[in-house]
């Protein structure tokens, strides 16, 4: 729990992880009935859309450029003048995907498991991708992984997701380091399949939670 | 574990001042804002405002401005909800609840208010 | 302030049934909306938040849905523990408001 319960809460919907193109709303929630704010990017490129404007309660962003990856913070106020800026909310980052060719996913032992047993996502390109990313569900989840080399050429990342108890649909980017917000194409869907047990959206070992989306590193 | 304790029930006259305590234990409380929540009987949920427990800093909803008072012993871990000039129709359950991103993760038990 | 609309206001069902709780809310609130179940005599409990996140320990027959003004709530094979009052509720932002309540009676 992040602290300071009067500063706005900044989210993304409908995800913070967004493809090259697409659009995403920024909503700058409050508990002090803020009705308008301001929004800015604390890193890399900054986004001219944005600069010296006031937003009512949420703005679409988009159609969405490498440029637009990286971390956003938001300042609730009321519509007075002068205006009086809020502290700044969280920060939120922001995820572009699509940039590079699509890695691959696979299970082991295999994407049907019995309940309780250990399952490891292997995320894998012929590219020299530095991190990969798993995604449960078109959510995002930490951790993110270091790109490994394997004896037959690929680069590889192993993320063990613990004694299976739920299902579910599984997708991976790849990124590079100096650019960790642009992802690639998510990689083709896995379906995990746990038997003996019905799939569930409450957290669990199978389901890393993530409230906020991506978090910085 | 987290809980949140209310005081018990009251029993008060028209005019009188009622003050409901709300003891928060198993987390941090200045970590969180505490909110009150009213249910007359056989009615539902109404929200009433929040405190920031580490400021202090009180806001009301509109139909709650004037006669309430939400306040804090942090040193105790617990809020207080004080209503002045007690009338009929205020007469209900009221509930302390944990906000975490704006809903509400855990309540207290309710303390009964009975003005009569 | 962002109006609630909650349906039906009271419903009777039996046992290994399914049904369905109803919210519309009088704008957009994207996937920010919370549901509780209250017993008689009892606090509310959130069940759902986020519009479909299930709480920790909630049983898997519950299963939040919707987003922008239009949300429900769905519980598979009724069991007797499930009967009582069911609440909506936006957080968007303040002036927080909750719906008028379902009452889920057995038949």
């Known amino acids: 729990h992040e602290g300071g319960q009067d500063k706005p809460l900044l989210s993304a919907w409908p995800s913070a992880v967004v493809p090259r193109g697409g659009h995403v709303t920024l909503l700058c929630r409050s508990r002090l009935g803020f009705t308008i704010f301001s929004l800015y990017k604390e890193d890399g490129v900054p986004v001219p859309e944005l600069y010296n404007k006031i937003f009512w309660k949420s703005i679409l962003m988009g159609p969405v450029t490498p440029a637009h990856a990286g971390t956003y913070r938001c300042r609730g106020s009321h519509p007075r003048s002068p205006i009086e800026w809020s502290a700044p909310s969280n920060p939120l980052v922001i995820v572009v995907t699509g940039l590079f060719g699509k890695p691959s996913l696979s299970a082991q032992p295999g994407p049907t498991v019995r309940t309780g047993e250990n399952v490891t996502l292997s995320c894998s390109s012929r590219s020299s991708f530095d991190m990969y990313h798993l995604s449960r569900e078109g959510r995002a989840h930490e951790p993110r992984l270091p790109a490994v080399p394997s004896v037959d050429g690929t680069f590889q990342a192993d993320f063990p997701l613990g004694p299976a108890t739920h299902g579910g649909t599984y997708t991976c980017f790849s990124s590079l380091h100096d650019s960790p917000y642009e992802w690639s194409d998510p990689s083709d869907p896995l379906l995990v399949s746990v038997t003996g047990n019905s799939s569930s959206s409450s957290s669990s070992p199978t389901e890393p939670s993530s409230k906020t989306g991506i978090r910085r590193h | 574990q987290i809980q949140l304790v209310q005081s018990g029930p009251e029993l008060k006259k028209p005019g009188e001042t009622v003050k409901i305590s709300c003891k928060a234990s198993g987390y941090t409380f200045t970590d969180y804002s505490m909110h009150w929540v009213k249910q007359a009987p056989g009615k539902g949920l109404k929200w009433m405002g929040w405190?920031?427990?580490?400021?202090?800093?009180?806001t009301y909803a509109d139909d709650f401005k004037g006669r309430f008072a939400f306040s804090l012993e942090t040193s105790a871990t617990t809020a207080y909800l004080q209503i002045n000039n007690l009338k009929n129709e205020d007469t209900a359950t009221y509930f302390c609840?944990?906000?975490?991103?704006?809903?509400?993760?855990?309540w207290g038990q309710g303390t009964t208010l009975t003005v009569s | 302030d962002i109006q609630m609309t909650q349906s039906p206001a009271s419903l009777s069902a039996s046992v290994g049934e399914t049904v369905t709780i109803t919210c519309r809310t009088s704008e957009n609130i994207y996937s920010y909306l919370a549901w509780y179940q209250q017993k008689q005599g009892k606090s509310p409990q959130l069940l759902v938040y986020n519009a479909k996140t299930l709480v920790e320990g909630v049983p898997s027959r519950f299963s939040g849905s919707g987003s922008g003004t239009q949300f429900s709530v769905k519980i598979n094979s009724l069991q007797p523990e499930d009967f009582g009052n069911y609440y909506c509720q936006h957080h968007y932002g303040i002036p927080f408001t909750f719906g008028g309540g379902t009452k889920l009676e057995i038949k």
């Open positions: 405190i920031n427990t580490e400021t202090g800093g009180p």
């Open positions: 609840s944990r906000d975490v991103d704006l809903y509400f993760d855990y």
